[in-house]
Interface confidence: low
């Protein structure tokens, strides 16, 4: 029964993030005659994939197509036979390829060539596997967002998102925080961008948008965690790592080989006495904290504002949908709730780092120990990034939502990045495309 | 140096047992989860079974369900597989392998049966042990 064909007239299409830590399969579904309506495109599957993310396996590229294999399929079942050879399929890479292209253009080259390859064999319409930038990450998040959120409808919703209703066309702020990268994209009240690198000129719908946004590629989770891993080494007496992000008596091995792999802490690389060393926890919100605000450089600016690292920031404007790691670590945390206050939040991150291991291990025992272990990094992380890296502040704080899905569909740049390909976003009625895209690759 | 070495491989006749042992040396066993994986002889790697970190999940590839069972024990750093009712198709080597990577969040929490792909995801191997079933 799957395979066959609807009785109503419905398009399908797909986007694959392949990100730092793994990937991810969107199949998207919209009434045919209403493409260009705003908000009709709403998920109907995600498939995680099995496995790292794509860039783990420039060694290894022939195992590529197993590792896609299982999605693919799922994806053949959902959507109905008579619908393959019209749906498109689009590869998105984000940061992780972005990493690994900066080691190795051709090695980046030969796993997305494979990734095409494989991409190719099934039914479906294939589009092309590319690298986006970190731009268009920040700008299709926002997309995304406002697009399910009604923002950039003119008319009377059809739907009510009741915990972010505004009752207004001011349109949300994206905060994205992925594996590798971190993105910030807002409408800023006061439209002076002052780096052209940031700025972001739409016509969506019939009104202008000029969007700042930005992506500190090296600052996700996962490669803040080894900056400030490879920066709390250097001072180190020996290869004990006594590590406040870490719950009291957590022990890990740790690689030198591993630590230096990537790009991200080259800045911190040096010649260590040892090849291993081992991380034991002090479990210490406040130093944690500490430590991590040494990742970011604040004593140069070179604009009126700034985030960290010399980048320009304007001053916050609005509410902010905060997606991917930031709704994922703070939701295990239990600390979306709009409720809470950021003065809270701090508070419950000092108590949930100052918790044994013992007993956080046996407090969440169905939960893989390796993520277990860094929860406390990453809500420190999280509320560093926030407060110290982006200037909001406690009064602002109750501006940032968390947000897992907005009418059942992912918040992320994947389904912003489709109906840009696929010319559903018209720009009066439908004329022009909100962002160009580059050649695949 | 970290490493992990398996041992216990050896010739059994069909219905018979074996214990395969997997210890490591440079790291603690407890903080990671441990797969086993076998490779016949002409064929691509596959995911057997698997343990938690903690011990309280295994997991087991439908072919072996039933017949073998993983196991640690903390005080010798030492992860096991016990091989019962072996069959000739159990034939093949028997590989450990350690999920080490220090990068956070590389998966959700998964099943650790599967062919290469998975293969790909863990870190650290040893160099095999060879179990061959025959009468």
């Known amino acids: 029964t799957q395979n066959k064909a609807l009785p109503e007239n419905v398009k399908y299409g797909i986007v694959l993030d392949a990100g730092s830590s793994h990937t991810s399969l969107y199949i998207y579904k919209w009434p045919a005659e209403k493409e260009n309506d705003t908000g009709v495109v709403h998920q109907v599957e995600e498939c995680r994939v099995k496995g790292p993310g794509i860039s783990k396996f420039v060694q290894k590229v022939n195992e590529i197509g197993i590792y896609l294999t299982d999605c693919m399929e799922r994806a053949r079942e959902v959507i109905p036979r008579s619908q393959h050879q019209e749906t498109p399929v689009y590869l998105g890479a984000t940061a992780g390829m972005r990493l690994l292209r900066m080691e190795s253009e051709e090695l980046a080259d030969r796993v997305l060539d494979v990734v095409e390859r494989s991409l190719s064999n099934y039914p479906f319409d294939f589009q092309g596997a590319r690298i986006i930038t970190g731009q268009e990450e920040g700008a299709y998040g926002w997309i995304t967002i406002n697009y399910l959120l009604g923002k950039f409808s003119q008319k009377t919703r059809w739907f009510s998102i009741v915990p972010y209703e505004t009752n207004n066309q001011e349109t949300f702020g994206a905060l994205d925080l992925g594996g590798a990268s971190t993105q910030v994209t807002f409408v800023p009240q006061n439209q002076t961008i002052e780096s052209p690198d940031n700025a972001l000129q739409f016509r969506l719908y019939g009104k202008d948008y000029n969007v700042y946004t930005h992506s500190f590629l090296c600052y996700g989770k996962d490669q803040a965690l080894w900056q400030k891993l490879a920066k709390d080494i250097q001072v180190a007496s020996n290869e004990i790592l006594r590590d406040p992000c870490f719950h009291p008596g957590y022990k890990k091995v740790v690689n030198v080989s591993d630590l230096y792999k990537t790009p991200c802490t080259k800045r911190f690389e040096m010649t260590l006495p040892f090849q291993q060393f081992e991380i034991q926890g002090i479990g210490n919100y406040q130093q944690c904290h500490q430590s991590i605000l040494e990742l970011f450089n604040t004593s140069y600016c070179p604009y009126s504002q700034c985030a960290f690292n010399g980048i320009f920031l304007p001053p916050l404007q609005g509410d902010f949908g905060a997606f991917s790691a930031f709704y994922f670590v703070m939701k295990f945390l239990n600390l979306t709730s709009e409720k809470v206050s950021q003065e809270k939040v701090t508070e419950m991150m000092k108590k949930f780092c100052a918790q044994p291991w013992e007993e956080i291990k046996t407090s969440y025992a169905g939960v893989k120990e390796k993520y277990l272990s860094e929860y406390c990094f990453s809500g420190t992380y999280i509320l560093s990034l926030l407060l110290q890296g982006y200037h909001f502040t406690a009064d602002s704080w109750e501006h940032i939502h968390f947000i897992g899905k907005i009418q059942g569909s992912d918040a992320g740049w994947t389904l912003g990045y489709m109906l840009n390909l696929t010319n559903m976003i018209p720009a009066e009625q439908p004329l022009s495309t909100p962002l160009s895209h580059s050649t695949y690759v | 140096e970290v490493q992990v070495v398996e041992s216990g491989g050896g010739l059994v006749q069909p219905g018979g047992s074996l214990r395969l042992s997997c210890a490591a040396s440079g790291f603690t066993l407890d903080y990671y989860a441990i797969a086993w994986f076998r490779q016949a002889p002409g064929k691509g790697r596959e995911g057997v079974s698997c343990i938690s970190s903690s011990g309280g999940s295994t997991n087991y590839a439908d072919s072996v369900k039933g017949r073998f069972t993983a196991s640690r024990d903390t005080a010798k750093n030492t992860v096991y597989l016990q091989m019962n009712s072996l069959k000739p198709e159990d034939t093949a080597v028997y590989y450990c392998?350690?999920?080490?990577?220090?990068?956070?969040?590389?998966?959700?929490?998964?099943?650790?049966?599967?062919?290469?792909?998975?293969?790909?995801?863990?870190?650290?191997w040893g160099q095999g042990t060879q179990v061959t079933v025959s009468s």
């Open positions: 392998a350690a999920d080490l990577s220090a990068a956070p969040y590389n998966d959700a929490v998964r099943s650790c049966t599967g062919g290469n792909r998975l293969a790909a995801t863990y870190d650290f």
